[in-house]
């Protein structure tokens, strides 16, 4: 922490300007009034402060606003945002997308994924839901940031907004997030024709249940292996060899290349070797002919 000293009369600060770059840390601490700093935050980013000096300015604002900064200050943080921790940001209430854009621009190229995730969370909370304008802002200024939101926050996305989400925006989404987004996407695209529907639903299929994957296998979609590999393991395991062959179409030969990777490996172990042999790919590891499969989990459930 910066030690407290009194401000020399000749160093008194009446406005935030370039002269402050010559102030030592303790002089900034003693001479800059926090309320003045907050009122003139829009000037700070144009001044080439050192990181040490920015630490002092942050300390000033923290003292003035122990419960969290107001949006009028947040909007003009500029490079001071790089000094914020997720804990600081959690105290904020942000509703303006202009504020979000400004801070996303500042964070670009810096290792700030945790801070950005917290900021986006605060924006969604502040605005009440993940509306189209927010999604559009995220896709434009922070591709992939949509996936930084928790499944709980994503549940506030109305299906009508799903159309604005691009495949690259879902690239970093985990299974739990896709579990939330998939039903919304299914609803949003339900009136589309088969091929158009598949193109649209493809990025969301990591959240699809087995019955939906089985349904797709009847629609000649020729799913590529990249999409197949992103399906939930639980959705893939019940598929028959015939269903997978129909689902993948000409891409079925890719199973050979991916046979060591889950979920392909796990699916192979569940199939009869005779059935796998019908694919002519040399896939190995299926259940040998003549073996009986007992599902012990069923017996446990009954006892």
């Amino acid at each position: 922490d910066v030690e407290r000293t009194t401000c020399p009369p000749e160093k008194e600060v009446h406005e935030i300007d370039e002269s402050l770059i010559f102030y030592k840390k303790r002089e900034l601490e003693a001479c800059v009034d926090a309320a003045l700093l907050a009122a003139q935050m829009d000037r700070v980013d144009a001044i080439p402060f050192t990181y040490e000096q920015l630490d002092v300015l942050k300390h000033k604002l923290d003292e003035l606003y122990p419960q969290g900064y107001p949006e009028s200050v947040i909007r003009h943080l500029g490079h001071l945002f790089l000094k914020m921790s997720p804990e600081d940001i959690r105290k904020w209430n942000v509703t303006s997308l202009e504020t979000l854009k400004a801070l996303l621009k500042v964070s670009k190229g810096h290792e700030m994924s945790a801070q950005v995730a917290t900021l986006i969370d605060r924006v969604v909370v502040g605005r009440g839901q993940l509306d189209k304008d927010t999604v559009d802002t995220l896709t434009a200024f922070c591709p992939g940031c949509l996936c930084s939101l928790s499944p709980e926050r994503l549940s506030s996305v109305p299906p009508s907004v799903i159309g604005a989400v691009r495949p690259q925006d879902l690239d970093t989404c985990g299974p739990r997030q896709l579990d939330v987004l998939y039903p919304k996407a299914r609803l949003a695209f339900q009136n589309m024709s088969g091929s158009e529907y598949f193109v649209k639903i493809r990025p969301f299929l990591g959240g699809a249940p087995t019955e939906d994957v089985k349904a797709l296998s009847q629609q000649n979609v020729s799913m590529d292996l990249a999409t197949f590999m992103k399906l939930r393991r639980e959705a893939v395991l019940p598929l028959t060899v015939a269903e997978v062959q129909k689902l993948l179409g000409p891409h079925v030969e890719g199973l050979k290349v991916e046979e060591q990777h889950s979920p392909v490996r796990d699916w192979i172990l569940k199939q009869r070797q005779d059935d796998l042999d019908t694919l002519g790919l040399g896939l190995q590891g299926g259940i040998p002919n003549g073996y009986l499969i007992l599902d012990l989990s069923v017996r446990e459930a009954l006892s």
């Epitope: 690239d171 890719g254 889950s262 040399g282």
Partner: antibody, heavy 119, light 108 residues
Framework: EVQLVQSGAEVKKPGASVKVSCKAS????????MDWVRQAPGQGLEWMGD????????IYNQKFSGRVTMTEDKSASTVYMELSSLRSEDTAVYYC????????????WGQGTTVTVSS | EIVLTQSPATLSLSPGERATLSCSAS???????LSWYQQKPGQSPRLLIY???NLASGIPARFSGSGSGTDYTLTISSLEPEDFAVYYC?????????FGGGTKVEIK
């Protein structure tokens, strides 16, 4: 433009570890596996293993099992290859190469990272 | 593992001549799972041909590939000065993936 940019050259002592990074840009990161291939001075190419950035699943060439670890950071579109217990014969150029999932050919390669193991 | 043996190790030819490079596998390779790469000194390998005979993007038509089972061939119909390099075959029909030892095409 599709690009794979690898980290810089490394000089390591025997027994140490090295971690090489490969940053991808210009394509959907999770639609392609990232494979690692190495080439000892004046020698041919040797496949080390791959990682599926979508699931984090890995397959390693048994020759390197227990010594190689491949990881990914989806948010940074970056994969890493760490090789431990280095010996002089690990001196090589290490390449990352992308491979569309479901195919086995490498259509884009990184520029290579030279790793020198010397006491 | 499948061992790929390339022959000859070195091929000395003049520009304009036809080059025929061989790749022999120790056991059968599914033809969809064989590719060829070109590598010049100090550069990364470059994909030339995939699935035995498909030309990669931007590769001139003087390059062609053929073969099945255990024997595969890369042909350069008329050598250009920029074609002098090392060529590798590669299989992903069987785990672990393997490369051939390479054929160096040098100027005679």
């Amino acid at each position: 433009e599709v690009q794979l940019v690898q980290s810089g050259a490394e000089v390591k002592k025997p027994g140490a570890s090295v971690k090489v990074s490969c940053k991808a840009s210009g394509y959907t990161f999770t639609d392609y596996n990232m494979d690692w291939v190495r080439q000892a001075p004046g020698q041919g190419l040797e496949w080390m293993g791959d990682i599926n950035p979508s699931t984090g699943g890995t397959i390693y060439n048994q020759k390197f099992s227990g010594r190689v670890t491949m990881t990914e950071d989806k948010s940074a579109s970056t994969v890493y290859m760490e090789l431990s217990s280095l010996r002089s014969e690990d001196t090589a150029v290490y390449y990352c190469a992308r491979r569309r999932i479901g195919t086995g050919y490498f259509d884009v390669w990184g520029q290579g990272t030279t790793v020198t193991v010397s006491s | 593992e499948i061992v790929l043996t390339q022959s000859p190790a070195t091929l000395s030819l003049s520009p304009g001549e036809r080059a025929t490079l061989s790749c022999s596998a120790s056991s059968s390779v599914i033809s969809s799972y064989l590719s060829w790469y070109q590598q010049k000194p100090g550069q990364s390998p470059r994909l030339l041909i995939y699935r035995t005979s498909n030309l990669a993007s931007g590769i001139p038509a003087r390059f062609s590939g053929s073969g099945s089972g255990t024997d595969y061939t890369l042909t350069i119909s008329s050598l250009e000065p920029e074609d002098f390099a090392v060529y590798y075959c590669h299989q992903w029909s069987s785990f672990p993936y393997t490369f051939g030892g390479g054929t160096k095409v040098e100027i005679k």
